[in-house]
């Protein structure tokens, strides 16, 4: 069962796996959640009468029974991992810890204006795990305003001590705030020859890449496939690093694949979740349980529902014996990966899906899109919302996109005539406008945040955020879309769709059913040629067919231009303006969301 509560002045006795240092009990809980085996933890706070060298220790624990005896201890804070919980979990920690020195290997020392600048440097440095910044009141004059970038073998501090007039914090790479390049290519027949920092067993190159991304020091990797000539190295995933962050040598070798960590684009790429099934594959590891059940999907569900289970192998029944039930072997290991992989024994293997909730909800696979036709089907565009205005009469005003559990991204021009958020309602999970009745649940709008440089749609900055009055629980019909990664500036999106309930032609009415249209992106140069009297800036993005015929129109404003890349949907544009609707050689103009990622994050993550 999920226990989120922290127990003050309580120590969990026994079950120790390892001890790390964390600046708070909450951070200790997150570290425990991300550790392959940790189910419980005890944190020693600075209020503890214990020797100060024990302050900030985070003791990660495991227990077969998933519980441990509780002992009274002043200053100890204990709790459970979020592994047992269904809510989204993030490794993102934006806190700045005052009068705290988080120790690690300092590898860069430079002067910074403030702690935010220091944190930004850390976030945009591939090696940095955390930083310490000496404030302008630090006693040693020459050390004032010094920003120390640090890393460790584990990604957590080697020690934490109290120190006046310094502040410490973590890299925000896991908050999707890094500007580092995001190299998603997999290089076939390639071995990166740099030294290994670790090696694990993986069934394919994509699992290897996710493991590398999740590892604090892995910057790139090499994976030896099951056809690799040296048997003892088959399915081996070699995690690597280098000072420059790039492989120093690439060697051509068949049956090997190499690639890079996705640490700087991890918000829009599933890095924890390994959802695939591996047929005719047996994962070896420590056996947790053996259960009779029907089918490998049921076996995966069983593994996901069992806190200590990390991976499984399902052995299908022979013929029709045992009522069609096979054996489900629930397994675990010290690092969450199989100790060995065997083929040709008829098993079907896979991983627990409980790690999927550690990925951003926007990366969750949605129902396959229905190709052809204009009308959407339920669950096809779960981020699309309809924004209603209730005064003087209730009607659809604009589209919008869910980007967080309390945030909708839409167009600023939707609010040209809106005086107060009180007259707005957000309906999510809606396919047909006719579904909306008096008693249909909605989200009230607490705040409208319009970009302060917005004047009119045609001059740009046509972007606004709606802060909802209550938080949204994600379901199959309402969940967020990923923002494009700032490190992905070179991505060329091809699979792009515009959706909305807007007019189908210029003189028309709002549609009942959510409409969809696949539309190709148009270069800004081409778009500028079509709109000579306007300035098409890099903060705009255009889409449309040369011959016209498909476009966004009145009522679609604020809605998404959604593009699928690497199996993940990204909010590339916000429907903004255009000359007529679907006119020949008049593409639609959309707000270029990637240019506003900093603005979005600044507004949505303000305290």
């Amino acid at each position: 069962e999920c226990v989120t509560k922290l127990f003050k002045d309580i120590y969990f006795q026994g079950g120790d796996i390892t001890t790390v240092f964390t600046p708070s009990a909450k951070h200790c809980q997150v570290v425990c959640t991300h550790h392959p085996r940790c189910l419980l933890f005890t944190f020693i706070a600075e209020s503890s009468p214990e020797d100060p060298t024990k302050w900030f220790t985070c003791i990660l624990k495991d227990s077969v029974t998933e519980t441990l005896p509780m002992v009274n201890m002043t200053g100890a804070i204990s709790g459970y991992s979020f592994k047992q919980c269904s809510h989204q979990i993030s490794a993102c920690n934006k806190n700045i810890y005052v009068d705290v020195d988080m120790k690690g290997l300092n590898y860069n020392s430079s002067i910074a204006k403030n702690a935010q600048e220091c944190q930004e440097r850390c976030t945009n440095d591939m090696h940095c795990h955390f930083f310490t910044y000496a404030t302008r009141w630090f006693p040693s004059v020459e050390h004032r305003n010094i920003c120390l970038l640090k890393y460790t073998q584990t990604g957590t501090p080697t020690r934490i001590t109290k120190l006046s007039e310094v502040v410490s914090g973590f890299s925000l790479k896991s908050c999707a705030l890094s500007n580092l390049a995001c190299i998603r290519d997999i290089f076939p027949s390639t071995v990166f020859a740099d030294s290994n920092i670790d090696s694990v067993v993986a069934p394919d190159v994509f699992v290897c890449r996710r493991i590398c991304t999740h590892h604090p020091n892995c910057l790139f990797f090499t994976f030896f496939s099951q056809e690799w000539p040296k048997e003892s190295e088959r399915n081996l995933c070699l995690l690597k690093t280098s000072v420059s962050g790039l492989p120093s040598t690439r060697i051509k070798k068949n049956k090997a694949l190499s690639g890079f960590s996705l640490q700087s684009c991890r918000h829009s790429v599933p890095v924890f979740c390994h959802p695939s099934f591996y047929h005719d594959t047996d994962f070896l590891g420590e056996e947790l349980d053996i259960v009779d059940m029907k089918g490998h999907e049921a076996c995966q569900k069983m593994c996901t529902d069992t806190s200590r289970c990390q991976f499984f192998t399902y052995s299908p029944p022979h013929e029709s014996c045992n009522g069609g039930k096979g054996k489900c072997y629930l397994k675990l290991s010290s690092n969450g990966s199989p100790t060995k992989i065997l083929y040709g024994r008829g098993g079907i293997s896979g991983y627990t899906l409980r790690l999927c909730k550690m990925d951003n909800a926007c990366t969750t696979k949605i129902k396959p899109r229905v190709v052809g036709g204009r009308a959407s089907v339920p669950g096809e565009w779960p981020w699309q919302i309809t924004l209603h205005i209730i005064s003087p009469t209730q009607k659809h005003l604009c589209g919008g996109s869910i980007i967080g559990n309390q945030w909708i991204l839409t167009a600023a021009h939707c609010f040209d005539e809106v005086e107060s958020p009180k007259i707005l309602r957000v309906y999510s999970g809606i396919l047909n406008q006719s579904e909306i009745k008096e008693d249909t649940s909605f989200f009230a709008v607490q705040e409208i945040i319009i970009h302060d440089q917005y004047e009119i749609a045609e001059s740009g900055y046509d972007i606004a955020l709606l802060k909802l009055g209550t938080t949204m629980n994600y379901t199959d019909s309402q969940r967020p879309i990923c923002l494009p990664s700032k490190g992905d500036t070179n991505v060329i999106y091809s699979d792009c769709w515009v959706t909305g309930w807007g007019y189908r032609k210029l003189r028309d009415k709002i549609q009942n059913t959510l409409q969809k249209a696949e539309i190709p992106l148009v270069t800004n140069e081409e778009c500028q040629r079509r709109y000579r009297s306007h300035k098409i800036t890099d903060k705009m993005i255009c889409a449309g067919y040369k011959e016209g015929g498909k476009d966004a129109c009145k009522g679609d404003s604020g809605g998404p231009l959604s593009c699928k890349h690497n199996e993940v949907w990204h909010l590339v544009g916000i429907t903004s303006w255009g000359e007529g609707c679907a006119h020949r050689e008049r593409p639609g103009v959309y707000t270029n969301v990637v240019k506003y990622v900093d603005w979005i994050l600044e507004k949505t993550q303000a305290p």
Partner: antibody, heavy 116, light 107 residues
Framework: QVQLEESGPGLVAPSQSLSITCTVS????????IYWVRQPPGKGLEWLGM???????DYNSALKSRLSISKDNSKSQVFLKMNSLQTDDTARYYC??????????WGQGTTLTVSS | DIVMTQSHKFMSTSVGDRVSITCKAS??????VAWYQQKPGQSPKLLIY???YRNTGVPDRFTGSGSGTDFTFTISSVQAEDLAVYYC?????????FGGGTKLERL
Amino acid sequence: QVQLEESGPGLVAPSQSLSITCTVSGFSLTGYGIYWVRQPPGKGLEWLGMIWGDGRTDYNSALKSRLSISKDNSKSQVFLKMNSLQTDDTARYYCARDYYGSKDYWGQGTTLTVSS
Amino acid sequence: DIVMTQSHKFMSTSVGDRVSITCKASQDVSTAVAWYQQKPGQSPKLLIYLTSYRNTGVPDRFTGSGSGTDFTFTISSVQAEDLAVYYCQQHYKTPYSFGGGTKLERL
């Protein structure tokens, strides 16, 4: 683990120059300042100067004109050069790592004798 | 330049005694003072930095206090292995400087 090791000539004639190397391991010179400190036989510690992680330098005012500190980050080495040596420069020379102005790790030191 | 003065060159003590060594700065150095221990034939060892912060692994019998210009280093209960020379150092402003040292010897 963190280590610092000084290596020097041992004996230098008066008016000659001195060059001592401090080779470090277990940490990066881009992230830490390195100090030079000397101790004449039977006397106290004297601060000579330092080089910061970003390459800036600071020197003891009295010795500034004779001292020069540099480093090679890739080789993990810091260099102390001192010219116009006199007999009162005879001392044990230490390099030490910076921790907010204090020195948390020291080398074993290298003895320099200035004598003809 | 800042001058650090340790008024006692020598101090006599017995095992179990409480002993305090003082250090005076020629100008305000805030709380940027460190204390080192040096035994014969060895390199100095950092005990205290920024007036009162104990370095990793330093026993809690060693403490430091003070601010501005007057600083004190205290050993609450002297052990035989504590007999050594103790130096203060200001790390407020470069050029950093050491005190002349105080030798702690057996009574």
